[in-house]
Interface confidence: low
Amino acid sequence: LPRWRQQWSGSGTTSRFPETVLARCVKYTEVHPEMRHVDCQSVWDAFKGAFISKYPCNITEEDYQPLVKLGTQTVPCNKTLLWSRIKDLAHQFTQVQRDMFTLEDMLLGYLADDLTWCGEFNTFEINYQSCPDWRKDCSNNPVSVFWKTVSRRFAETACGVVHVMLNGSRSKIFDKNSTFGSVEVHNLQPEKVQALEAWVIHGGREDSRDLCQDPTIKELESIISKRNIRFFCKNIYRPDKFLQCVKNPEDSSCLSGI
């Protein structure tokens, strides 16, 4: 008889999760020479150790420390790109602007991007049926705690001018409850980060409003300024043209700062 399993509100662990993580790790270390020293089996073991046989609503950042240690990576100053609610464009950007990095361009972010996982208390099994939902079940679940942990670390290690891409189509352009608003903003280090530059991405071609004047952006500016970090904001009215010019900066039509 199949043993009883806790039913959570969220979708279960991504199919072939261990194989996916291991394969991504191997691929990443092959492509990034500075990470060639990483032993992917050890990475998987550390990843697995963070959540296997643990109650999936009682995961802590401490659980992920062995993994974080193995995945230690630094981003050059001025090259960190944070994002909130606009992941696809941020990733399209760093795919072209290869010297800038989102969290998902780093090893740990790359391993976990778009995946779901959880285990069960006192068994070595992975739960492929359901996992805790952040709202309906609990916030201290394996996936949420992972992203909180690596996002905190990513922000803590940033230096120089940090950029953040924000979605100008949302009612809250800056959302204090997002990972960016609740974790990354508060973990930028004023002694290392001289400025945060927000890029507000416009959704509509006819939209010429200055979204840098949006009340939520002013709120972000206030939070950042109180932390003794300078704040700048730019409207990106034409994200399609923005990417086009990142691809072809030598095009005479693209002689503009981003």
Epitope: S208, Y237, R238, C254, G257
Partner: antibody
């Protein structure tokens, strides 16, 4: 090939008005911010005004605020500068210049220029 | 009085290296990109340098730009007689919400 062709300059008395035009070709006009830059005889360049790709945002140098109006007609690929209450100090060659794709970016500068049209304000 | 400050003149002999400075403040050069333009006598300005140090295609690599803090400079190496022109620096000024130019530097190639 990008081309910008200014017209509408000439001799005008103090207090008079002129409307400059800049006909653009060789690129998608409504993708770009545009500017007017002037140069008084024997002097340096002075940025006058700029307008965003869809006309939604305009800026002016303090000395012409309330006096000049920048506009554009994207259906005609044309940029305009309406100049009222002209003074002797407005005498200059006026250049139309193509700015950046992202109007308020910190890199708003000018990759292409027209040959300029001379405005002379004198009685 | 220009917002950005340039020396009114500079000179050099063919083959020499000449540097033109451009000084501003935190609201323009300090926070924003600098570009440089060359204006030959009787012609419209031409973009030489953008984004502080980038050259548009077609501009010889004898021209280079750099920036430090609130100052920028244009260097011309291997000076040629055809480089004799007026040179202008330009930036965006965040507090003025507009572009600003330097007063221009007249470069004379001697001999």
């Amino acid at each position: 090939e990008v081309q910008l062709l200014e017209s509408g300059g000439g001799l005008v008395q103090p207090g008079g008005s002129l409307r400059l035009s800049c006909a653009a070709s060789g690129f998608t006009f409504d993708d770009y911010g545009m500017s007017w830059v002037r140069q008084a005889p024997g002097k340096g360049l002075e940025w006058v005004s700029d307008i965003s790709w869809n006309g939604g945002k305009t800026h002016y140098v303090d000395s012409v605020k309330g006096q000049f109006t920048i506009s554009r007609d994207n259906s005609k690929n044309t940029l305009y500068l309406q100049m009222n209450s002209l003074r002797a100090e407005d005498t200059a060659v006026y250049y139309c210049a193509r700015g950046s794709l992202f109007h308020d970016s910190s890199g708003f500068y000018f990759g292409h220029w027209g040959q300029g049209t001379l405005v002379t304000v004198s009685s | 009085q220009s917002v950005l400050t340039q020396p009114p003149s500079a000179s050099g002999t063919p083959g020499q290296r000449v540097t033109i400075s451009c000084s501003g403040s935190s609201s323009n050069i300090g926070d924003n990109y600098v570009s440089w333009y060359q204006q030959l006598p009787g012609t419209a300005p031409k973009l030489l340098i953008y984004r502080d140090s980038q050259r548009p295609s077609g501009v010889p690599d004898r021209f280079s730009g750099s920036k430090s803090g609130t100052s920028a400079s244009l260097a011309i190496s291997g000076l040629r007689s055809e480089d004799e022109a007026d040179y202008y620096c330009q930036s965006y000024d965040s507090s003025l919400s507009g572009s600003v130019f330097g007063g221009g530097t007249k470069l004379t190639v001697l001999g």
